[in-house]
Interface confidence: low
């Protein structure tokens, strides 16, 4: 029904090819294949995509042709299973090919790797990139899709098409500029940072659907869309939520052609019904498709209607609360969430979901009580501590951020989180704590009314990175517990963790603290990561070290790097001064 009501098609592959057009069809199939077979060479994927495209064209010409009636999963799965080196490259993933659909696709999905063993993407010289772009634009852009998709197997495919369009525009403009590097590099940096953020946000949506189910995702979507479209009727929001859930379920499930097609339909619907959705959509709806969909996804919150009545009337004071709840629990809770969220653009989505959960729990208990109204009359009082907890946490952390600056704020979080969960791998702790620390620059600049939605919803995205990386190789029961018990309480769960008293400190290994002259040629960011890696290792060796002790060692370390990078014989300096630094640090920390 609705946006996605379609006639039955004899050939699904022909239908999607016609809907999406050849260029988007090929790009999406490439993304799909690269997200499944993350280790396969680029050339192999291009060959598979070309074969699928040629086959799709035969089905467009004659939908009754042989195999054209097969499902996309069957066609794509059969194609992936023709890869000769599947067993050698992917090990047990090759066993997926012995299964029938839909089990085969589920098997491929389970083998997606959030942290694939792939080399870091090194950016070539600008002239080299521009030459490659001009020599073969199509291959150059396909390579971009391939490299991003295989490193980010849950990247939102239609959004990756938008990134590729911007990537192409950057090269088209900058490769003919007088100063190519000055034009291109900032644009590529922006695309890289936005791309990482987009990937992480989508990863949370997929985790929400896959680990906590459709109901959890729909609740998130009701809250977010109600904040964004407070003038829209509940039924309109519900319809958008249903359609959005279908889109993300498809993309998270590897059904990228259906996902992109349905996302385009949803954007069309939203723009055709702007009047009953939001006054902020006009500019978005004038853009071409990819830009339009992106713009709608990022659109600012509409103004709240001026005359919204008190929530208490319908959800506390009314004698029909239990009757309405019993008649259709999820609809009634959805209405509560909608009404609360549209009134509170200043709350994070996860806070709104905690409030809805508290309301649900209260009704479950009270509607079975002797006097239900008396029982739930004070339910809104229970919200106060739930609201104050993130408010206070954000206030304290923004004060700390303003006092320390981003790098030192990250270091404070590195120490805090290493003490909480010291079993987690050092690279993961560094990556996650650096990202947690970015909340300061991202959100503390905002006025009070925008801080909480910015900060807490961003922290949910970052903590999900920790959860998916930890799931691959679980090492900490505390992380598993916080990640799996409740999606909306992940952040409070991690915040509540104290120092892990059961942790046995790591043996001291001088090699971990041996540095070489190559550190001097690193970018400032890479150098910070080296220092932060050392800091995590220090805490793992000495979890009871005080802030002052750690600060002294880190200051000595910074001075040591600075001194040796200025020395004539850098390598000798690092060898000799490094030994002294290790000895001094051991003494300072009592190792």
């Amino acid at each position: 029904r609705g946006v996605f009501r379609r006639d039955a098609h004899k050939s699904e592959v022909a239908h999607r090819f016609k809907d999406l057009g050849e260029e988007n069809f090929k790009a999406l199939v490439l993304i799909a294949f690269a997200q499944y077979l993350q280790q396969c060479p680029f050339e192999d994927h291009v060959k598979l995509v070309n074969e699928v495209t040629e086959f799709a064209k035969t089905c467009v010409a004659d939908e009754s042709a042989e195999n054209c009636d097969k499902s996309l999963h069957t066609l794509f799965g059969d194609k992936l299973c023709t890869v000769a080196t599947l067993r050698e490259t992917y090990g047990e993933m090759a066993d997926c090919c012995a299964k029938q659909e839909p089990e085969r696709n589920e098997c491929f999905l389970q083998h997606k790797d959030d942290n694939p063993n792939l080399p870091r993407l090194v950016r070539p010289e600008v002239d080299v990139m521009c030459t490659a772009f001009h020599d073969n634009e199509e291959t150059f852009l396909k390579k971009y899709l391939y490299e991003i998709a295989r490193r980010h197997p849950y990247f939102y495919a239609p959004e990756l098409l938008f990134f590729a369009k911007r990537y192409k525009a950057a090269f088209t403009e900058c490769c003919q500029a007088a100063d190519k590097a000055a034009c291109l590099l900032p644009k590529l940096d922006e695309l890289r940072d936005e791309g990482k953020a987009s990937s992480a946000k989508q990863r949370l949506k997929c985790a929400s659907l896959q680990k906590f189910g459709e109901r959890a995702f729909k609740a998130w979507a009701v809250a977010r869309l109600s904040q964004r479209f407070p003038k829209a009727e509940f039924a309109e929001v519900s319809k958008l939520v249903t359609d959005l859930t279908k889109v993300h379920t498809e993309c998270c499930h590897g059904d990228l052609l259906e996902c992109a097609d349905d996302r385009a339909d949803l954007a069309k619907y939203i723009c055709e019904n702007q009047d009953s959705i939001s006054s902020k959509l006009k500019e978005c709806c004038e853009k071409p498709l990819l830009e339009k969909s992106h713009c709608i996804a990022e659109v600012e919150n509409d103004e709240m209607p001026a005359d919204l009545p008190s929530l208490a009337a319908d959800f506390v004071e009314s004698k029909d609360v239990c009757k309405n709840y019993a008649e259709a629990k999820d609809v009634f809770l959805g209405m509560f969430l909608y009404e609360y969220a549209r009134r509170h653009p200043d709350y994070s989505v996860v806070l709104l979901l905690r409030l809805a959960k508290t309301y649900e729990t209260t009704l479950e208990k009270c509607c079975a009580a002797a006097d239900p109204h008396e029982c739930y009359a004070k339910v809104f009082d229970e919200f106060k501590p739930l609201v104050e907890e993130p408010q206070n946490l954000i206030k304290q952390n923004c004060e700390l951020f303003e006092q320390l600056g981003e790098y030192k704020f990250q270091n404070a979080l590195l120490v805090r989180y290493t003490k909480k969960v010291p079993q987690v791998s050092t690279p993961t702790l560094v990556e996650v704590s650096r990202n947690l620390g970015k909340v300061g620059s991202k959100c503390c600049k905002h006025p009070e009314a925008k801080r909480m939605p910015c900060a807490e919803d961003y922290l949910s995205v970052v903590l999900n990175q920790l959860c998916v990386l930890h799931e691959k190789t679980p090492v900490s029961d505390r992380v598993t517990k916080c990640c799996t018990e409740s999606l909306v309480n992940r952040r409070p769960c991690f915040s509540a963790l104290e120092v892990d008293e059961t942790y046995v400190p790591k043996e001291f290994n001088a090699e971990t603290f041996t540095f070489h002259a190559d550190i001097c040629t690193l970018s400032e960011k890479e150098r910070q990561i080296k220092k932060q890696t050392a800091l995590v290792e220090l805490v793992k060796h000495k979890p009871k070290a005080t802030k002052e002790q750690l600060k002294a060692v880190m200051d000595d370390f910074a001075a040591f790097v600075e001194k040796c990078c200025k020395a004539d014989d850098k390598e000798t300096c690092f060898a000799e001064e490094g030994k002294k630094l290790v000895a001094a640090s051991q003494a300072a920390l009592g190792l």
Epitope: G2, V3, A235, K239, N273, S276, V331, M335
Partner: nanobody, 115 residues
């Protein structure tokens, strides 16, 4: 399962009247605004009229203002559209929807205005 079943359509002469009904089930009818939408042969859906959940606020498309009246009975979970002074251009399949959506749920009811 949300269900909307429209009835009351038929063949009528220009200037005549019809009363359409829409029986709702599967959701808390009294909590939702509702609309009537129509689709003429070969054309896209056209929003006709809307009513808020309590029935106090009604809206109409310019083309039907003064001729059509939307109402509801929340106890019976039914939405109505009283159509007077019908014109040939009112010929279409009429269906009711939740909110201001133009998404079709029910099968609709055919209204034909012809002499």
């Amino acid at each position: 399962q949300v269900q909307l079943v429209e009835s009351g359509g038929g063949l009528v002469q220009p200037g005549g009247s019809l009363r359409l009904s829409c029986a709702a089930s599967g959701f808390t009818f009294g909590s939702f605004g509702m609309s009537w939408v129509r689709q003429a042969p070969g054309k896209g859906p056209e929003w006709v009229s809307a009513i808020d959940s309590g029935g106090g606020d009604t809206r109409y498309a310019e083309s039907v203002k003064g001729r059509f009246t939307i109402s509801r009975d929340n106890a019976k979970k039914t939405l109505y559209l009283q159509m007077n002074s019908l014109k040939p251009e009112d010929t279409a399949v009429y269906y009711c929807t939740i909110g201001r959506s133009t998404s079709r749920v029910g099968q609709g009811t055919q209204v034909t205005v012809s002499s």
